[in-house]
């Protein structure tokens, strides 16, 4: 039969510039001598010869004189190859081919890696920064391999995904320099972190920059928003109220107004230097231009969706700046529940029935209550499931298993906790007349 050749299943990971051992072994029979051995290492794809041993002699490296065998270990079946000063170009599959009487071969993968340098951060512009200014933060990390994954986040660790451009360029050695550019509208102040990850080494290199915009000696702008969340029905329009107190002589040319998502800092809508810069949020937002000069910075959000739910920051900068966050709570009423009964015929006292109460397209998740005809809660043996559709609206299905009495009414109440809206349905079951003894 064929000779069994063993190599590691997982790729061998080697750092650029270091030496790597590509393990390969076979089981020599008793009385085996090296004179019988033919060993060939070659590149799996191109069949290019890398190193060989034949007729009892090491035939040497055919691969830039950077390979070696372990001659003292060959007789014990160790056919491993030492690859020196690993380069990016070495990455790939190497086949270890062993022939004695029979022959066998196996391929081992070499995965080359190089750690990325600690990122350097540049900020443009880097002086006279004000809230509302757009800045470009560049994160550069050098001489890594393979291509990096780059992540941006704010000081709270929230990912920043919008307006990121990342480019990676390989040098002559095949190592990558990565440059990632984040464009961001400045808030009151902020920390921006860049993390460069080597996916093979699972090595993270990170740096951050903290930007504190210029403050005016005349003091901050006071921004007012409602304390309670704004509740908006799905599909309707919502107004996120925000106001400031303009000073005498205030003109809109002096105003920087930015609405952004509080967590991700994603721009929603802006007004700068006398002009409405428009919606950056699916064209569903609008300001109240005729009211801005009076200090009304409110935002109109049209055709509200479940995905809009969350906190929005209203950021006002005139001489100085101020900001406040308003929460949007999205809601959708639940439909009147439909009730199904199984089984639904030939029912007798003592039978177990399943009553299903279904209500559709509500938000947020519902609270479901069951009760009997006297209003007594039924808590035992209730299973409720809620599934969100593509729009994020919930369909609720609640199942009650109950043993029938002589007759009974069973009510299901579906409550929307935000709207405090109750939708209910009920079913009345009248069992067949009982005969004694009950029929078998």
């Amino acid at each position: 039969g064929a000779l069994e050749v063993q190599v590691p299943e997982d790729p061998v990971v080697a750092l650029v510039g270091t030496d790597a051992t590509l393990c390969c072994s076979f089981s020599p029979e008793p009385g085996f001598s090296l004179a019988q051995l033919n060993l060939i290492w070659q590149l799996t794809d191109t069949k290019q010869l890398v190193h060989s041993f034949a007729e009892g002699q090491d035939q040497g490296s055919a691969y830039a004189n950077r390979t070696a065998l372990f001659p003292d270990l060959l007789a014990q079946g160790n056919a491993s190859l030492r690859l020196q000063r690993v380069r990016v170009a070495d990455e790939g599959s190497f086949t270890c081919f062993v022939s004695i009487r029979d022959f066998g071969s196996a391929a081992v993968s070499l995965q080359v890696a190089a750690p990325y340098s600690k990122p350097s951060m540049t900020l443009e512009p880097n002086k006279d920064l004000r809230p509302g200014d757009t800045v470009t933060i560049t994160c550069s990390s050098y001489q890594g391999y393979p291509e990096a994954e780059v992540f941006w986040q704010d000081g709270q660790g929230v990912p920043l995904t919008g307006n990121v451009t990342t480019s990676q360029m390989a040098n002559e050695q095949g190592l990558f320099d990565v440059h990632s550019i984040l464009r961001v509208v400045l808030g009151a102040n902020g920390t921006y972190s860049c993390l460069v990850r080597n996916p093979v080494l699972q090595q993270d290199a990170h740096s951050s920059v903290t930007i504190t915009p210029q403050r005016s000696p005349t003091g901050a702008v006071e921004v007012q928003v409602p304390e309670d969340p704004v509740v908006a029905l799905v599909g309707t329009d919502a107004t996120l109220r925000c106001s400031f107190s303009p000073e005498p002589g205030f003109s809109l040319a002096q105003l920087n107004l930015i609405w952004q998502l509080t967590d991700t800092k994603q721009l929603v809508h802006s007004f700068t230097e006398g002009r409405d810069q428009g919606s950056a949020y699916a064209n569903r937002t609008a300001l109240f231009p005729d009211l801005l000069a009076q200090g009304n910075a409110s935002l109109r959000l049209q055709r509200v969706r479940v995905a809009d739910e969350g906190s929005f920051t209203c950021f006002v900068s005139i001489r100085d700046f101020g900001s406040a966050a308003v929460s949007l709570q999205v809601a959708a009423p639940y439909s009147k529940p439909s009730m199904t009964l199984e089984p639904n015929k030939d029912l007798r006292p003592g039978d177990t029935v399943t009553i299903t109460c279904s209500s559709y397209r509500g938000y947020p998740e519902a609270e479901v209550f069951w009760q009997d005809g006297q209003g007594v809660p039924l808590t035992g043996n209730v299973t409720t499931s809620q599934m969100a559709n593509e729009q994020g609206l919930f369909d609720v299905h609640s199942v009650l298993r109950v043993v029938l009495g002589a007759n009974g009414t069973y009510s299901c109440l579906v409550r929307n906790p935000v709207l405090q809206q109750d939708a209910h349905g009920s079913v009345t079951i009248t069992g067949q007349p009982m005969t004694f003894p009950p029929e078998a």
Epitope: E124, P125, K127, D128, R130, D133, T134, V135, T136, T138, I181, R183, Q214, S216, P217, T218, G249, S251, A253, Q254, E273, G274, Q277, R319
Partner: antibody, heavy 116, light 107 residues
Amino acid sequence: EVQLVQSGAEVKKPGSSVKVSCKASGYTFTAYWMNWVRQAPGQGLEWIGRIEPYDSETRYNQNFRDRVTLTVDKSSSTAYMELSSLRSEDTAVYYCARGVRIFDYWGQGTTVTVSS
Amino acid sequence: DIQMTQSPSSLSASVGDRVTITCRTSENIDYTLAWYQQKPGKSPKLLIYNANTLEEGVPSRFRGSGSGTHFTLTISSLQPEDFATYFCKQAYDVPRTFGGGTKVEIK
């Protein structure tokens, strides 16, 4: 090193147009607004307008709005200022300058002479 | 537009003199004022921004002050290389507007 290099001097006839270029290097071109400022002989400085290279948003001085067009070519990091319907009082040195509130780097200036 | 009034329009001084240039604005611009120096045949050079922040590389003999509508540029001890024209510029509103300039000449 940040540099703004402008195109050479121009002599134009009244009623014609002139297009001045400003090639930027040494910084991220899309990170800074590019302003255009002119200076008539022996006079002060007059702001014409500015453009944001990232998305080509422009702001103009109303005095020039009908006659000036600001554009950029991001691939070559070059900003352009075109002034039409030239008259003799447009004779001036035209500068590009980067920044939004502070103009920290200026081009060397392009002399535009309008003469019949 | 915000009007910028610079005074004097010119002055003569000697090396070592203390020189003060004034800039007034037609409305409150808070502290958003910059000062530029221009030598004959050259581009303007930024000296001071935000009324009192010295640009990198500018000698400390230049000092800006003021806020609101009244601003001054002071050169504590005039040097030969300081003979030039100085402009103020407001960055509070669009259009940006410049003062008429002050020419500092050798006495």
